[in-house]
């Protein structure tokens, strides 16, 4: 038995103190308007369908419908007592998409269609989504619409995030195969892209793929191995979308950040988290030769988004995703370091001293020590009588070294009046000087040789 305490319907006149289900009249198998409770809330009856009259005489509206008097006021006990008839109107007024791929003006119409379908022994129609079929739900007042700020950031920055792929040559066939990939982001409309130095290491061919699927060959413009930042360039007609650099110095622990990358063509990977620490020393992290500070975040950084941007909620780059140390702890190179790198790179290129151009003379050499000299002398009777300098292992054909007259087994003992003790001394002078006046020990002769280094792409 039902107690009236549980009833949702307003108490109507003439209702029994206790509901007795046995006294309820039998109901038809199918109800056009769906089932509803009678005015007393005791018995299940057939509800009036949408648009049908409702009120005291006519009975209740079906499921999801409410009885509304012509003035738009929902029928109450008072209305009923006045015996004023209302109309059954759907409580929900927005369109819905049904599983039968039809759009219904409201939920009640979908329910009615579902009842008809079941009557014909077909599957019921269920709600697939709010809004018309094939149309996104764009309710500006929905929570999803109001609070998905991460998705908003991603939408804003994604076009400027690129996929980078490196290729190597097979040893004999010389066919190129992919060897590694990473991400990067565009910083200038004419195609300058920032990524990690470790992403574009060595003499690999670098291919860049944009969000729209267009692919380009990239040239390495500048690299800072220590800071792990590289600048590459693609030649693109027209303006490219760019990301702006924020101030990493103004970052606060607890700020939301988004790490985005492009590990596969035409796809982005997004992780999010907060800034844990704004300045973690590289030495602290056990990174070799790094005295740089890193941004620590719990946003997951992995091979897929390495080289991509770490952005704040304004879509400004505050770091380059760089490495994952342990689960839940990742690090990014601060944007202030990127700014410094880009400024210095611009200066170098303006002065024609970009790291892209490497000075080269075409020798392989090693530092000569007294023990190495003794060993070589034992092996070659005519080896020069020297105990330090740069010993030439190999002179590469068609290079400045060969043109200048350097030969294998020569020992460079001075360049431009400065004595040479090690191979490093030679490397340093090559970087600095445009002409190398060398004194070379060959057998037991000292020979003067002039070599003009050439500039090559690294």
């Amino acid at each position: 038995q039902l107690s009236r305490a549980g009833r949702s319907a307003p108490l109507a006149a003439g209702c029994p103190d206790r509901c007795e289900p046995a006294r309820c009249p039998p109901q038809p198998e199918h109800c056009e308007g769906g089932r509803a409770r009678d005015a007393c809330g005791c018995c299940e009856v057939c509800g009036a369908p949408e648009g049908a009259a409702c009120g005291l005489q006519e009975g209740p509206c079906g499921e999801g419908l409410q009885c509304v008097v012509p003035f738009g006021v929902p029928a109450s006990a008072t209305v009923r007592r006045r015996a004023q008839a209302g109309l059954c109107v759907c409580a929900s007024s927005e369109p819905v998409c049904g599983s039968d791929a039809n759009t219904y003006a409201n939920l009640c119409q979908l329910r009615a269609a579902s009842r008809r379908s079941e009557r014909l022994h077909r599957p019921p129609v269920i709600v697939l989504q709010r809004g018309a079929c094939g149309q996104g739900q764009e309710d500006p007042n929905s929570l999803r619409h109001k609070y998905n700020f991460i998705a908003d950031v991603v939408e804003k920055i994604a076009p400027a995030v690129v996929h980078i792929e490196l290729f190597r040559k097979l040893p004999f066939s010389k066919r190129e195969v992919p060897v590694a990939s990473g991400s990067g982001f565009i910083v200038s409309e004419d195609g300058l892209i920032v990524t990690n130095a470790h992403v574009v290491t060595n003499k690999h061919r670098v291919k860049v793929e944009l969000k729209n699927g267009a692919t380009y060959e990239a040239k390495i413009k500048d690299v800072d191995e220590k800071a792990d930042i590289a600048l590459i360039k693609i030649d693109h007609q027209g303006k490219l979308p760019v990301l702006l650099l924020g101030r990493s110095s103004e970052l606060r622990p607890g700020e939301f950040v988004v790490a985005i990358g492009s590990p596969f063509s035409l796809q982005n990977t997004v992780t999010t988290g907060i800034v844990s620490t704004t300045q973690r020393g590289g030495k602290e992290l056990g990174l070799r030769n790094s005295d740089m500070d890193y941004i620590q975040t719990d946003a997951i950084i992995n091979y897929g988004n390495s080289g991509g941007p770490l952005v704040n909620l304004d879509g400004e780059v505050i770091g380059i995703n760089t490495l994952k140390v342990t689960a839940g702890i990742s690090f990014a190179i601060p944007s202030d370091k990127i700014k410094k790198f880009l400024t210095e790179s611009h200066d170098r290129q303006a002065k024609g001293k970009a790291i892209t151009k490497k000075k080269y003379i075409g020798i392989r050499m090693m530092s000569l020590t007294s023990s190495k000299a003794k060993e070589l002398k034992d092996r070659h009777r005519d080896f020069p009588d020297v105990i330090s300098g740069a010993y030439i292992i190999e002179v590469i054909p068609d290079t400045p070294a060969e043109a200048g007259g350097l030969k294998e087994n020569d020992v460079i003992i001075s360049i431009n009046g400065q004595s040479v003790v090690s191979a490093n001394d030679v490397s340093d002078v090559i970087k600095r000087e445009s002409t190398l006046n060398m004194v070379v020990r060959r057998g037991n002769e000292d020979i003067m040789i002039t070599v003009i280094p050439e500039e090559i792409d690294p």
């Epitope: 040893p171 066939s173 066919r175 195969v177 060897v179 190999e394």
Partner: antibody, heavy 123, light 105 residues
Framework: QVQLVQSGAEVKKPGASVKVSCKAS????????MHWVRQAPGQRLEWMGA????????AYNQKFKGRVTITADKSASTAYMELSSLRSEDTAVYYC????????????????WGQGTLVTVSS | DIQMTQSPSSLSASVGDRVTITCSVS?????MYWYQQKPGKAPKLLIY???NLASGVPSRFSGSGSGTDFTFTISSLQPEDIATYYC????????FGQGTKLEIK
């Protein structure tokens, strides 16, 4: 994980030919060259040749040129080495080995090897 | 052709000893590679690019050198290190040293 599984031992008569197979798994077969290296009893390892499984392009050690043929079946991820006009000094263990590549230095080496196939040439 | 000379061809050492093997090439090479081969087994890469340890190889193994002279070292010999060791270069095509057979005293 990367695995190279070779066919079983063979006994051949002088003048005959032998064909050894090498089934690769655990990596993209066409992204690496497959090489063949042999080792005669008490001798050093000796490189015979290589194939690019994608294109079928080959390279051979001059010493074996004309006697060795390396082929590959992409669909089966299998490489083959056939040595003809066998002589007693071809008695050796024949290995297939994948070309490895150093991302840092750009150097080449052999990173994975088959278990070896003993070919005995005897009359 | 590049000639490779590995020395010694065999050596006997005690557990815990420091063991050094050298490899000389007839003309300069960029890198040297070192392999370990146990009886009845295929060679196993230990050192790549002259001095880099291959994945899963114990740190007691190391390599050094440049140009024409290269060295392979086991800092503290262990019983499981008994094997033959080969050096390998790859300039125009791969060639191997004749091997060094290492035994326990």
């Amino acid at each position: 994980q990367v695995q190279l599984v070779q066919s079983g031992a063979e006994v051949k008569k002088p003048g005959a030919s032998v064909k050894v197979s090498c089934k690769a798994s655990g990596y993209t077969f066409t992204d690496y060259e497959m090489h063949w290296v042999r080792q005669a009893p008490g001798q050093r390892l000796e490189w015979m040749g290589a194939i690019d499984p994608e294109t079928g392009g080959t390279a051979y050690n001059q010493k074996f040129k004309g006697r060795v043929t390396i082929t590959a079946d992409k669909s089966a991820s299998t490489a083959y080495m056939e040595l003809s006009s066998l002589r007693s000094e071809d008695t050796a263990v024949y290995y297939c080995t994948r070309e490895g590549y150093s991302y840092e230095g750009g150097g080449y080496y052999f990173d994975y090897w088959g278990q070896g196939t003993l070919v005995t040439v005897s009359s | 052709d590049i000639q490779m000379t590995q020395s010694p061809s065999s050596l006997s050492a005690s557990v815990g000893d420091r063991v050094t093997i050298t490899c000389s090439v007839s003309s300069s090479v960029s890198y040297m590679y070192w392999y370990q081969q146990k009886p009845g087994k295929a060679p196993k890469l230990l050192i790549y690019d002259t001095s880099n340890l291959a994945s899963g190889v114990p740190s007691r193994f190391s390599g050094s050198g440049s140009g024409t002279d290269f060295t392979f070292t086991i800092s503290s010999l262990q019983p499981e290190d008994i094997a033959t060791y080969y050096c390998q270069q790859w300039t125009s095509y791969p060639t191997f040293g004749q091997g060094t057979k290492l035994e326990i005293k």
